[in-house]
Each structure stands twice: as structure tokens, then as C-alpha cells.
């Protein structure tokens, strides 16, 4: 599996962000596809579960991401993206996207470095 992500993402505190992860695979996409999202905080604390998809989306039942994450992917379009709502400053860190599409289960895990900021930079306003 080959992963494509937005790599670096900057978003404003209190807003929602789409964590984009798409993939390619030598195998046809089917019901065996799984997507796992995890989070590594900036402070180096333990990795935390964010989201899991296998036929249906499975949201975390507890923890920081409970009721704050939803599936925004589409397997037919090779899209494994998620939406993270109501961003907080302690959401800063690295989000990892792992896609397995048996028999294609190897490959690099995609990473997105999320920076939650007070306000968007002028250069980004200019190009929106």
C-alpha cells in the first residue's frame, strides 16, 4: 500500500479539520480494507487511538477524541480521510494513517503533522 497525505496541516483553534489520507494498492479494494488512525502528541506521550474503519466506521468510545471524529473517506475513491471537530491546542501533534487492503498489507504509514493555531496566517488568507 502506498499512502498520500497532506503531510502538514495548520488549522485554527475551535474549527474542524479534514485529515486527508488517500492510498494506492495492487489489490482491488474490497470488504477486507481496514484503516487505522492514531495520534502521537507533541509532548511525546503514548500513542492514542483516533479512529478505525472496516466496512463501517468505529469511533473511539472514550478519550480525547470521543465524539470529535468522523469518517470522511470513500474506499472506492481510495480515500481514507477523517474529520476532526472542534480543534484544541492539545490536538497538536502527528496523526498517522495506516491502510491495509489484504493481501496488500505492507507499506509506509502516512503521517500528518497538525498545528492548531490562534489565527490563520495572512499568506493563507490571501490564497483562500
Amino acid at each position: 500500500v502506498e499512502i498520500y497525505t497532506s503531510r502538514v496541516l495548520e488549522a485554527v483553534n475551535g474549527t474542524d479539520a479534514r485529515l486527508k489520507c488517500t492510498f494506492s494498492s495492487f489489490a482491488p479494494v474490497g470488504d477486507a480494507l481496514t484503516v487505522t488512525w492514531n495520534f502521537r502528541p507533541l509532548d511525546g506521550g503514548p500513542e492514542q487511538f483516533v479512529f478505525y474503519y472496516h466496512i463501517d466506521p468505529f469511533q473511539p468510545m472514550s478519550g480525547r477524541f470521543k465524539d470529535r471524529v468522523s469518517w470522511d473517506g470513500n474506499p472506492e475513491r481510495y480515500d481514507a480521510s477523517i474529520l476532526l471537530w472542534k480543534l484544541q491546542f492539545d490536538d497538536n501533534g502527528t496523526y498517522t494513517c495506516q491502510v491495509k487492503n489484504p493481501p496488500d498489507v505492507d507499506g509506509v504509514i502516512g503521517e500528518i503533522r497538525l498545528s492548531v493555531v490562534h489565527t490563520v496566517r495572512f499568506s493563507e488568507i490571501h490564497f483562500l
Partner: antibody, heavy 119, light 108 residues
């Protein structure tokens, strides 16, 4: 060897519809999506729409009301139909395979079919 | 829609030269940027996908780079067959995917 070949009418009357068939070989339409792109005389490339491996479609919003893409997997053919053609729809129409899946690059293209809209 | 701008519409170079073709997006496209070559007969070929990944069969003298809104295609040691028109295309948001206006590379 991956190949795509468009076949179209060449000349279309204004207000009439355009039908183009893209016949593919060297890969299966159950595994890869197919895009349609056009190039007007002396102009750049314009993405029109895509049909994915499972049969769902996405269209350029500028054409959604008059564009339809379908396919027959068993015949390895993709069908493009655009209604209500006008002179500014004169262009070369290409079909292209969606390669690299979620990289969304068009990795192999047909040679294109020239369409002139004129009475 | 995301606008893709190739500010240089034509470029002259000599055999053996190294040339860089630029492309700018109207917003961050997260490296979802592809490069195509179109020959005068209309034939279109993919060169680079996802900013810097070389499509199979494409010579290594082609390379891509960039991030956020600014991207470039570099051709080192130009060969006769490289004189063509080059288009960038963003595939970050769908629909629609959009192309740059093209840069025609001509022999000096």
C-alpha cells in the same frame, strides 16, 4: 500493454448530443477508474468527469447538468455522453486511466478524438 | 475551484540544458500535484505524480518538487524528444481537478 482508444462522431450539430466510446485493453474497468478530459483549440486541458471502478461517478460542476458517464465492464468500454453541444464544445476529447489510485494521476491516455460542433 | 497557474507559457532552451517549469496553485494542494507532457500530435503522457514520484518508464532526467502552493518540474540534460508542452494538474480536491495553462518548451 495498457491502451485506451476513443471513438466519436467527429462532427456534431449545435444543440445535439455527443457520444464517445472509450475502449480499453491491458487492464480491467473493475479495478481502475477512467477520466474524461478535453482540450479546446489552442487551449489547455479541462477535466470533465470520472467513473470509478465500482461504477460511481464524479463530474465537473460546470457540466453536471448535461454530462453522463457510464461503462460496460464486460466489454471494457466507457461511455461518455454530453448534451446540448455548442460551438465552444469543439475540442479534442480524451479518456485516461486513473492510475496510482488515491494519487489521482491519469497514468495512461487515449490518443483523443476530435469533435467539431458546427451546422 | 482551485486555479493552477503556469506563468511561463513558452520557454526556449538548447539540447543538454537544464530547465525548470513552475506551477502555482491558488491554495494549498497538499502535494497532490501531477505533471504531464503533451506532444504536438496530441499524445499525452504522465511524468510525475504526487509532486515528486516518477511514473514508470519516465527517464530519471525528469524530477518534481514543491509543497503547499508552489511546485516545479525540472528536466536535466534536455533531449530532442523533450521539446513539448508541459501541464501541471492538481488532484487535491475533487471535483473538479484542474490543470495549468501549459508551458511550451521550444528549441533555441
Amino acid at each position: 500493454e495498457v491502451q485506451l482508444k476513443e471513438s466519436g462522431p467527429g462532427l456534431v450539430q449545435p444543440s445535439q448530443s455527443l457520444s464517445i466510446t472509450c475502449t480499453v485493453s491491458g487492464f480491467s474497468l473493475t479495478r481502475y477508474g477512467v477520466h474524461w478530459v478535453r482540450q479546446s483549440p489552442g487551449k489547455g486541458l479541462e477535466w470533465l468527469g470520472v467513473i470509478w471502478s465500482g461504477g460511481s461517478t464524479d463530474y465537473n460542476a460546470a457540466f453536471i447538468s448535461r454530462l453522463s458517464i457510464s461503462k460496460d465492464n464486460s466489454k471494457s468500454q466507457v461511455f461518455f455522453k454530453m448534451n446540448s453541444l455548442q460551438a465552444n464544445d469543439t475540442a479534442i476529447y480524451y479518456c485516461a486511466r486513473n492510475g496510482y489510485d488515491g494519487g489521482y494521476a491519469m497514468d495512461y491516455w487515449g490518443q483523443g478524438t476530435s469533435v467539431t460542433v458546427s451546422s | 475551484d482551485i486555479q493552477m497557474t503556469q506563468t511561463t507559457s513558452s520557454l526556449s532552451a538548447s539540447l543538454g540544458d537544464r530547465v525548470t517549469i513552475s506551477c502555482r496553485a491558488s491554495q494549498d494542494i497538499s502535494n497532490y500535484l501531477n505533471w504531464y507532457q503533451q506532444k504536438p500530435d496530441g499524445t499525452v503522457k504522465l511524468l510525475i505524480y504526487y509532486t515528486s514520484r516518477l511514473h514508470s518508464g519516465v527517464p530519471s532526467r525528469f524530477s518534481g518538487s514543491g509543497s503547499r502552493i508552489d511546485y516545479s518540474l525540472t528536466i536535466s540534460n534536455l533531449e530532442q524528444e523533450d521539446f513539448a508542452t508541459y501541464f501541471c494538474q492538481q488532484s487535491d480536491t475533487l471535483p473538479p481537478w484542474t490543470f495549468g495553462g501549459g508551458t511550451k518548451l521550444e528549441i533555441k
